[in-house]
Amino acid sequence: ARPRTELLNVCMDAKHHKEKPSPEDGLHKQCSPWKKNSCCFANTSREAHKDISYLYRFNWNHCGSMTPACKKHFIQDTCLYECSPNLGPWIQEVNQSWRKERILHVPLCKEDCEQWWQDCRTSYTCKSNWHKGWNWTSGYNQCPEGAACHPFHFYFPTSAALCSEIWSHSYKVSNYSRGSGRCIQMWFDPAQGNPNEEVARFYARAMS
């Protein structure tokens, strides 16, 4: 874990992140809430909205077409990961070829997980951990041999399962609600400020 002084207003040492957060006026669509203070560049935010973008060559449509309602949560998830300067308390060192740091056990507000899970009910996948085990021979992820496509609820029977398992426990579901100052919101209205600043401060204090 990082020293206490580096838990607030920091960017991960990962594939596309800035070294330090700064304003980024041209952030695209769903990433725009982070434009006042961002760890992502404008071109990263544009790529976050694309299928099989250059960011990670990740194919959301690996089991047929993902519904727009579902996909927008994965875009928002990407924006949070790439752009948020408020994930410092959960940054961990990692020995991976493509990044030196990752997030672990970020407490996502329960409503954000519930909404994500409900909106992906009618989409399909073939795996419960999307970080590993794919067939990448085509240059993008495809289902490995023997992994059958089923509705999301088959692989993620609860909203907690979706949030915690999909990215190797990068997230966990918080028991706290949006607006509590105790959980990270994937979705927020920037007109009312970034609520995750207060959350990061709370957990940084708790960890010191």
Epitope: A69, K72, E114, Q118, G179, W187, F188, D189, A191
Partner: nanobody, 127 residues
């Protein structure tokens, strides 16, 4: 405060459909969270579902998921509740509610989160 007016209630046979409307006025916010609730005589108020108009994100109570659909018409400042495959147990007075808060998930189903309420419209489903 937001002014809310519901319409579209009435009587229908089981298996039938109705569409309720909730027209909002008198607010300056860009976006609203709007919820639908219902109350049958002698019973507790029950959440039906809700929508955050900024992202058109909807969330439903288990009792109606798959049968009811909430949608919006931004030009008309109106939110709709399309009710299909109606059952006698759907009989109730239906209310819409609104708040400028950004609600999603089960937050949309919490009556304490809303500060403006309509007068309600009656729905009767006979077998």
């Amino acid at each position: 405060q937001v002014q809310l007016v519901e319409s579209g209630g009435g009587s229908v046979q089981a298996g039938g459909s109705l569409r309720l409307s909730c027209a909002a006025s008198g607010y300056t916010y860009r976006r609203l969270s709007m919820g639908w609730f219902r109350q049958a005589p002698g019973k507790e108020r029950e959440a039906v579902g809700g929508i955050y108009t900024g992202e058109s994100m909807t969330y439903y109570a288990d009792s109606v998921r798959g049968r009811f659909t909430i949608s919006q018409d931004n030009a008309q400042n109106t939110v709709y509740l399309q009710m299909n495959s109606l059952k006698p147990e759907d009989t109730a007075t239906y209310y819409c509610a609104a708040t400028p808060q950004f609600l999603i998930g089960s937050g949309l189903l919490r009556p304490d989160k809303y500060d403006s309420w309509g007068q309600g419209t009656q729905v009767t489903v006979s077998s």
